[in-house]
């Protein structure tokens, strides 16, 4: 006998919950794979930079975005066959999994505080690398969706150490319509802005890590009331 | 060895056309954006236009916007001018060169190729 | 009248050091673009001699070296020989202009 009234509502809500987060998390996949496997991308690893090889921060980025879907798709898919099975089980390993990924949110939550100049500094060393290969390589699609990304969502441009060929490249095709790269050495530099988001606005990335934490606590709270639920429904 | 050959040039009525071509070997050319310099004579050197790896990206010099078009032939390891409304002032030595991205530069060029816009 | 300025002509005698300035502005050397330096032999092609601001391209002599500070480039031409009467030009970047630029060129002439 399946569980009933209100502890039915939460099922569904888990399952629905659940089953867009296992979505997200394969679009996150999807991309992360279509940008580590692209061949445009792939030549970025032979890349040389003047006479120095190019440092793989882009890539460190993308193994970053891989792993964080395929956890998103896994812990996704408990919350989600555990709520419509009324799987205690599954609904355990879920609950395990939540507790885990809080801890380590939390952990690299203080982490990311104490080292973020360090992490800006690999973010503009991704962004760099991904505009340099959006340049080197002008058939790398992936390449210039990240470096698009990065204007649109930072609403900038460029960056004062550009090259002469790439101040031209992103002159003519690459910058957001408003943003003015020729303006008196790039007021719109993505890598001021990326200093900014990380000193200035450090409290929008808390705001957003706060969303997931109290997202997590309450999936935590609906998969324990569910399994009691299921738990007590068995019972009669 | 790398190597750049330029031909098309010639004496050109004003208003006229001519195609450069630039022949290359002894580098990868489809992975190379490449450009064109010239210089009139007796005069200094003044870059043309400059072309991406795969024709994505490309500009001009405001004294030819408009009436030059650049393109390549990557099977055939080729570069192309095409000028249009020739001008007097349009008189010089044309030259085709490779430019580098690692040295953010013209490193490699061919021996140039005379065009003369005169009636 | 060339975005980046040269003199028109340089000379000096076997053996002794010439320098060859090149002054921008605040939109291309000034901005931190690179110059590079090419040099053209009489009725020849130019041939990059010197880029980066002071990097030579492998097969150019040590004799050859180049400096930057500010809005200017130089370059510099020690144990000056006879091979080296050429015209040099200075190239940088003018991100107001959105244009490669040079300078005029300088010819310069080795003397006796």
């Known amino acids: 006998m399946g569980v009933e009234g209100c502890t039915k509502c939460i099922k569904y809500l888990l399952f629905v919950f659940n089953f867009v987060f296992w979505l997200a998390g394969g679009v996150i996949l999807g991309v992360a794979l279509w940008l580590r496997h692209d061949p445009q991308t792939t030549n970025l690893l032979y890349l040389e930079l003047g006479d120095k090889p190019a440092p793989n921060t882009f890539y460190v980025g993308i193994y970053i975005l891989i792993a964080v879907g395929a956890v998103m798709m896994f812990v996704g898919f408990l919350g989600c066959y555990g709520a419509i099975q009324e799987s205690q089980c599954l609904l355990g390993t879920f609950f395990t999994c939540l507790v885990i990924l809080f801890a380590c949110e939390v952990a690299a939550g203080i982490w990311g505080f104490v080292n973020k100049d360090q992490i800006a500094k690999d973010v503009k060393q991704f962004y760099d690398q991904a505009l340099q290969q959006a340049v080197v390589d002008d058939d790398a699609n992936n390449a210039k969706a990240v470096v698009k990304t990065f204007h649109e969502t930072l609403d900038c441009c460029g960056s004062s150490t550009l090259t002469a060929l790439t101040t031209s490249v992103l002159k003519n095709n690459a910058c957001p319509s408003g943003s003015n790269i020729i303006s008196n050495l790039f007021k719109e530099d993505c890598h001021q802005k990326i200093d900014d988001l990380f000193s200035g606005k450090l409290y929008l990335i808390g705001i957003a890590a706060i969303v997931v934490a109290v997202i997590m606590i309450f999936e935590m709270i609906l998969s324990m009331v569910l399994c009691c639920g299921i738990r007590n429904s068995s019972v009669y | 060895e790398v190597q750049l050959l330029e031909s098309g040039g010639g004496l050109v009525q004003p208003g006229g056309s001519l195609r450069l071509s630039c022949a290359t070997s002894?580098?990868?050319?489809?992975?190379?954006?490449m450009s064109w310099v010239r210089q009139a004579p007796g005069k200094g050197l003044e870059w043309v236009s400059y072309?991406?790896?795969?024709?994505?990206?490309?500009d001009y010099a405001d004294s030819v916007k408009g009436r030059f078009s650049i393109s390549r032939d990557n099977s055939k390891n080729t570069l192309y001018l095409q000028m249009n409304s020739l001008r007097a002032e349009d008189t010089a030595v044309y030259y085709c060169?490779?430019?580098?991205?690692?040295?953010?530069?013209?490193?490699?060029w061919g021996q140039g190729t005379l065009v003369t816009v005169s009636s | 009248q060339s975005v980046l300025t040269q003199p028109s002509s340089a000379s000096g005698t076997p053996g002794q050091r010439v320098t060859i300035s090149c002054t921008g502005s605040?939109?291309?050397?000034?901005?931190?673009?690179?110059t590079h330096w090419y040099q053209q032999l009489p009725g020849t092609a130019p041939k990059l001699l010197i880029y980066?601001?002071?990097n030579r391209p492998s097969g150019v002599p040590d004799r050859f070296s180049g400096s930057k500070s500010g809005t200017s480039a130089s370059l510099a031409i020690s144990g000056l020989r006879s091979e080296d009467e050429a015209d040099y030009y200075c190239?940088?970047?003018?991100?107001?202009?959105?244009?490669?630029?040079f300078g005029g060129g300088t010819k310069l002439t080795v003397l006796g």
């Open positions: 060169a490779r430019y580098s991205y690692g040295r953010d530069n013209f490193d490699y």
């Open positions: 002894g580098f990868p050319f489809s992975s190379n954006y």
């Open positions: 072309i991406s790896s795969s024709s994505t990206y490309s």
């Open positions: 605040t939109s291309n050397i000034g901005a931190g673009y690179a």
């Open positions: 980066g601001n002071s």
């Open positions: 190239q940088s970047y003018d991100t107001n202009l959105s244009v490669w630029v």
